[in-house]
């Protein structure tokens, strides 16, 4: 079928178009082109006879048309009126006619558009702005761009006039942007230069900085004001309602209490005609006096007296603070603060309450501290300590005992032997003692200020024979690989040799065994379960020797990795499963079982009668020792096969 294709279909003015013929029949006589949708002699453009190759212009020929032997028609320098339909009339040799119609559209090349605006300086939240894309062009599409993005969806944006007009209602400062319009038709697209919308706004409520409102007398006051505004705001300062200056910053050096008051910043926008103000209240404080502490009792007695410390001077509407040992007050039922915090009462003072104590007066700006005060707490005497600690002496040596008791003021000492007063000294010395010097030696300590006395009695034995020793221990149940144990051989005796035996043997050489304190103390570092043995100490001098009863060390250890027995992992269906778990541990571990992760019982033996393949799975034994804080476990896989299906299976228990 004969068809006409227009190339291109949309043609720009001044360009050319080719009406291309497809499926032209064979054996032609000639053909003719007409403007329009039908054959009309008045609208013939050109005719062509094939035999003569002669082209004949028609009434509608404009001189811009060229016809080709293949019947295609080229039209050059296209004008707007060329838009429309074109008909090809083909005359075949048998004089049978055939017709085909084609068409194209002509569009102008668009000029570069521009934006006109009805308001060059709109006011925020008040004005609307209408942008119009110029010129008005037929058959053109209008598009708008904001900051090179397509228009956002907003109820304040409205397109009208075939999208040629963009209206922004109630403009805001955020509408300050680059606006462009674009015109498009099928043959061209052009963008305008950008137009920047200048929205007048503000001033917003000004901000005064710094935010600090409290100042100390003698400081400089430097306030700065800022308000968002377009064009930039003009600033004025008022103090207590009186105009000061028209600057953005207000500076007052060396302020005094008289500079306290309300400071107002006013921001003005000459274009919008709006004013906004912000007020800050500035308080200037005079330097407070340095506080000091008074006490109602300068020499309190421990566990008897209370002490009231008062922070001076008394100032109305002031916050009082306290510190003990350079720390804030600890929470204690013995510490009480008065309602105004000015008085700190220590109930039932102790020797640890000496301080130092400080009080402080707080104003808006800082805290002023008092000088520290230390309490002179009278205490003691505590139970006196008699040294050395020896209780056994050999005849002929000198006995020199010293007494000490914690006390404030220092204690006065007295010595008594078997209840009889000897002397009022801290030390007691007796030379060349005999068995007759055995007895009860009492040290009495007296505090003259508190009137309290305390005594300690020590039994001294003077003998050539040594007593039977005993072993004391600092840790009766040490944990393996963690604890150390110190055994001490009692009593401490002068001119005595100390010896040790383990399981009836002399001490083995080991870096974990250490003797100290004249061999009187035996320390075992990092004890192990193998140290759980019988320990004996012995004492000897030139005339006698004696041994202690044995002490067995109870070492806590484990639990070690448990062992599940029997080792079999394959069983026949119908057999009994009898698993026993064992782990070395002291104390004995707590046992528990899990089958396929599900907790079972807390026994050492797990028994399941007549097992089936349903009993397949993982059997875990868990062991726990709360004394060592350690846990351990082992997992065993059990496979149960139907009877006779697999060789080498255990028949079970």
């Amino acid at each position: 079928k004969l068809t006409i294709e227009s190339t291109p279909f949309n043609v720009a003015e001044g360009k050319e178009v080719l009406l291309l013929v497809h499926n032209l029949p064979q054996h032609l006589f000639g053909y003719s082109w007409y403007k329009g949708e039908r054959v009309d002699g008045n609208r013939q453009i050109i005719g062509y006879v094939i035999g003569t190759q002669q082209a004949t212009p028609g009434p509608a020929y404009s001189g811009r048309e060229i016809i080709y032997p293949n019947a295609s028609l080229l039209i050059q320098n296209i004008i707007q009126n060329d838009t429309g339909f074109y008909t090809l009339h083909v005359i075949k040799s048998d004089l049978v006619n055939e017709e085909a119609t084609g068409q194209f559209r002509v569009y102008p090349e668009l000029p570069k558009p521009s934006i006109s605006s009805n308001n060059s300086k709109p006011v925020e939240d008040k004005d609307a702005v209408a942008f119009t894309c110029e010129p008005e062009t037929q058959d053109a599409t209008y598009l708008w761009w904001v900051n090179n993005q397509s228009l956002p969806v907003s109820p304040r944006l409205q397109l009208s006039n075939g999208n040629r007009t963009l209206t922004l209602f109630n403009v805001t400062r955020n509408d300050t942007a680059s606006y462009k319009c674009e015109t498009q038709n099928p043959v061209s697209a052009r963008r305008s230069d950008s137009v920047i919308l200048n929205v007048l706004y503000g001033p917003d409520a000004p901000t005064i900085s710094p935010l600090n409102t409290s100042y100390r007398s003698g400081e400089n006051l430097n306030l700065s004001c800022h308000a968002a505004s377009n064009p930039p705001a003009q600033y004025s300062w008022f103090v207590n309602g009186t105009f000061q200056q028209s600057t953005q910053e207000l500076f007052i050096p060396n302020i005094t209490v008289n500079n306290s008051g309300s400071y107002t910043c006013q921001a003005h926008n000459s274009d919008t005609g709006l004013n906004r103000t912000t007020v800050t209240t500035i308080t200037v404080y005079a330097e407070p006096p340095k506080p000091f502490i008074t006490s109602n009792n300068s020499n309190p007695v421990e566990d008897e007296d209370a002490v009231a410390l008062t922070c001076e001077p008394e100032i109305q509407n002031t916050t009082y603070l306290w510190w003990v040992n350079n720390q804030s007050l600890p929470v204690s039922p013995r510490l009480q603060l008065s309602n105004d915090n000015r008085t700190l009462t220590l109930l039932s003072v102790t020797r640890n309450d000496v301080g130092p104590y400080e009080c402080g007066i707080q104003n808006e700006l800082s805290v002023d501290h008092s000088d520290p005060v230390i309490l002179n707490v009278l205490y003691g005497p505590d139970d006196p300590t008699i040294s050395p600690s020896y209780t056994y002496y050999r005849p002929g040596v000198n006995l020199s005992l010293s007494c000490h008791a914690a006390s404030n003021p220092p204690a006065q000492y007295s010595w008594l032997i078997d209840g009889n007063i000897q002397q009022h000294t801290q030390e007691l010395f007796i030379s060349n003692i005999t068995e007759k010097n055995s007895g009860l030696y009492t040290c009495q300590a007296n505090n003259s200020a508190s009137g309290h006395s305390r005594t300690t009695v020590k039994t001294i034995t003077v003998s050539a024979e040594l007593p039977k020793p005993s072993i004391s221990s600092n840790n009766s149940k040490p944990v393996e690989d963690k604890d150390a144990v110190a055994f001490t051989c009692e009593p401490e005796a002068q001119n005595t040799t100390y010896l040790w035996w383990v399981n009836g043997q002399s001490l083995p050489v080991s870096p974990r065994l250490q003797l100290s304190n004249g061999n009187r103390t035996l320390t075992l570092f990092n004890v192990t379960r193998n140290d759980a043995r019988a320990y004996v100490c012995g004492i000897q001098n030139s005339v006698s020797a004696n041994r202690s009863d044995p002490v067995t060390l109870d070492v806590l250890y484990g639990p070690d990795t448990p062992i599940i027995s029997p080792p079999d992992s394959s069983y026949l269906s119908g057999a009994n499963l009898n698993l026993s778990c064992h782990s070395a541990s002291n104390p004995s571990p707590q046992y528990s079982w899990r089958i396929n992760g599900i907790p079972q019982q807390h026994t050492q033996v797990l028994f399941i009668a007549k097992i089936t393949p349903n009993n397949n799975g993982t059997y875990a034994c868990f062991v726990s020792n709360l004394a060592t804080g350690r846990n351990n476990s082992i997992v065993k896989s059990i496979t149960v096969s139907a009877s006779g299906t697999s060789p080498g299976l255990s028949a079970g228990a």
Epitope: Q590, Y591, H602, T603, Q604, V605, L626
Partner: antibody, heavy 120, light 107 residues
Framework: QVQLVQSGAEVKKPGASVKVSCKAS????????LHWVRQAPGQGLEWIGY????????NYSQKFQGRVTMTRDTSTSTVYMELSSLRSEDTAVYYC?????????????WGQGTLVTVSS | DIQMTQSPSSLSASVGDRVTITCRAS??????LAWYQQKPGKVPKLLIY???NLVEGVPSRFSGSGSGTDFTLTISSLQPEDVATYYC?????????FGQGTKVEIK
């Protein structure tokens, strides 16, 4: 479910002996140790000792050593506690109780108690 | 033998109150401590073992804490059915010993 059922109340004269039984069911008898605890009227709980039903091993409180004997019969899943040389202060409810597991566990199931009255 | 000392020997509290009972061992028993509840005329019931492990089926308002020598049983919100005598017991080797008991009543 686990059950410990004890024998009935007994009245004995001073110097006599009493044997209280405790039949276990609902679990594997030999897997759990069984303890005996007594409670005098209006008083607290006092541990007497335990038996390992699997081995027959017993462990008695020093206070009852020499007067108490614990035995077991695995064929009937029963344990027995015999207390001899009874005196009036032995009047109490005697409980058997199962240990929750083996070694250093507390007592999770208790029998209903057997009242033993010692009176002349 | 390890001695177990309970306090108080008795207490009276209102429904919904938080109740605390303490138990002290004469020597270190680590975490081997159990708590029992005995209602009048009934057998003792195990509540807690290993100082803090709640036995299955025991209400979560019961909790235990402590280690070494000092232990606590807490009832977070006392209920009428909690009226009973509570005993602590060490299970750190034999002989097992019990505290003397704490009688809990409702005001």
């Amino acid at each position: 479910q686990v059950q410990l059922v004890q024998s009935g109340a007994e009245v004995k004269k001073p110097g006599a002996s009493v044997k209280v039984s405790c039949k276990a069911s609902g679990y594997i008898f030999t897997s759990y140790w069984l303890h005996w605890v007594r409670q005098a009227p209006g008083q607290g709980l006092e541990w007497i000792g335990y038996i390992n039903p699997n081995t027959g091993y017993t462990n008695y409180s020093q206070k009852f050593q020499g007067r108490v004997t614990m035995t077991r019969d695995t064929s009937t899943s029963t344990v027995y506690m015999e207390l001899s040389s009874l005196r009036s202060e032995d009047t109490a409810v005697y409980y058997c109780a199962r240990e929750y597991g083996n070694y250093n566990y507390p007592l999770d199931y208790w029998g209903q108690g057997t009242l033993v009255t010692v009176s002349s | 033998d390890i001695q177990m000392t309970q306090s108080p020997s008795s207490l009276s509290a209102s429904v919904g109150d938080r109740v605390t009972i303490t138990c002290r061992a004469s020597e270190n028993i680590y975490g081997y401590l159990a708590w029992y509840q005995q209602k009048p005329g009934k057998v003792p019931k195990l509540l807690i073992y290993n100082a803090k492990n709640l036995v299955e089926g025991v209400p979560s308002r019961f909790s235990g804490s402590g280690s070494g020598t000092d232990f606590t049983l807490t009832i977070s919100s006392l209920q009428p059915e909690d009226v009973a005598t509570y005993y602590c017991q060490h299970h750190y080797g034999t002989p097992y010993t019990f505290g003397q008991g704490t009688k809990v009543e409702i005001k």
